[in-house]
């Protein structure tokens, strides 16, 4: 005996209170595939979570986060707070970097600045609690009488004044 | 016996209202997920709208904005206001209680009417 439910599309779900008939379903409800016997309640953007794109007949809903939250987990499972750069979220709310660490998002948690002198680097720009530390040349290549990649500026003759 | 009696049907002008009720007997409406669908002459059923037991409502794009379904506890009464009727709401309307699997206020699938009332005409024309 062949399956009737297998020709209902995507839309509907077969009915087996109405021998197997195809039935829209209901508001509120989706099916994304054919053959379904239910129909699926749509997901509700409440609260923290805002529509991002409504709910079909064939399409579950999808949630977003309201302003100063940002998403977590699989098509938003859940919604973190945010926080300002220089900061990291813990159980206690959004707190400053540690001396030594820095985060240049509104999530995440804080990193520890690059460490220059591993990589045999100097610091050129030191790190503060939302930027990271700028790497330059190594101690070495800034040794009086170490070459330099660029050539001297050409003397001026004196009694001339720069054009 | 359980049991859904639909009223308040009638020919109406383009543009008028219409309110339709549907008295419940052998349980209560409030408790259960309750809707209103339709079937036009010559069509399939459509839904209209849905009420679920914590009084959210939802309703078809068809009629969003214009239809309104409540209920009165009290009277254990299901409604369905209808207004800015059009030619094309012209249907016999039923209402039913619907089958939804998950717990309490909260369900998770839809499977089905389980009641049907024998519905109530509507005619929309000038």
């Known amino acids: 005996l062949q399956d009737l439910c297998s020709n209902c599309p995507a839309g509907t779900f077969c009915d087996n209170n109405r021998s197997q008939i195809c039935s829209p379903c209901p508001p509120n409800s989706f099916s994304s595939a054919g053959g379904q016997r239910t129909c699926d309640i749509c997901r509700q953007c409440k609260g923290v979570f805002k529509t991002r794109k409504e709910c079909s007949s064939t399409s579950n809903a999808e949630c977003d986060c309201i302003s100063g939250y940002h998403c977590l987990g699989a098509e938003c499972s859940m919604c973190e707070q945010d926080c300002k750069q220089g900061q990291e979220l813990t159980k206690k709310g959004c707190k400053d970097c540690c001396f030594g660490t820095f985060n240049d998002q509104k999530r995440g948690i804080c990193r520890p600045w690059t460490n220059c002198s591993l990589d045999g680097k100097s610091v050129l720009v030191n790190g503060t609690k939302e930027r990271d530390v700028v790497c330059g040349p190594s101690p070495a290549d800034l040794s009086p009488g170490a070459s330099s990649a660029t050539p001297p500026a050409p003397a001026r003759e004196p009694g001339h004044s720069p054009q | 016996e359980v049991q859904l009696v639909e009223t308040g049907g009638g020919l109406i002008q383009p543009g008028g209202s219409l309110r339709l009720s549907c008295a419940a007997s052998g349980f209560t409406v409030s408790s259960n997920y309750m809707s209103w669908v339709r079937q036009a002459p010559g069509k399939g059923l459509e839904w209209v709208s849905v009420?679920?037991?914590?009084?959210?409502?939802y309703y078809a794009d068809s009629v969003k904005g214009r239809f309104t379904i409540s209920r009165d506890n009290s009277k254990n009464t299901l409604y369905l206001q209808m207004n800015s009727l059009r030619a094309e709401d012209t249907a016999v309307y039923y209402c039913?209680?619907?089958?939804?699997?998950?717990?309490?206020?909260?369900?998770?699938?839809?499977?089905?009417?389980?009641?049907r009332g024998q519905g109530t005409t509507v005619t929309v024309s000038s």
């Open positions: 039913a209680r619907d089958r939804y699997y998950g717990s309490g206020n909260y369900p998770t699938a839809y499977y089905g009417m389980d009641v």
């Open positions: 009420i679920y037991s914590d009084g959210s409502t």
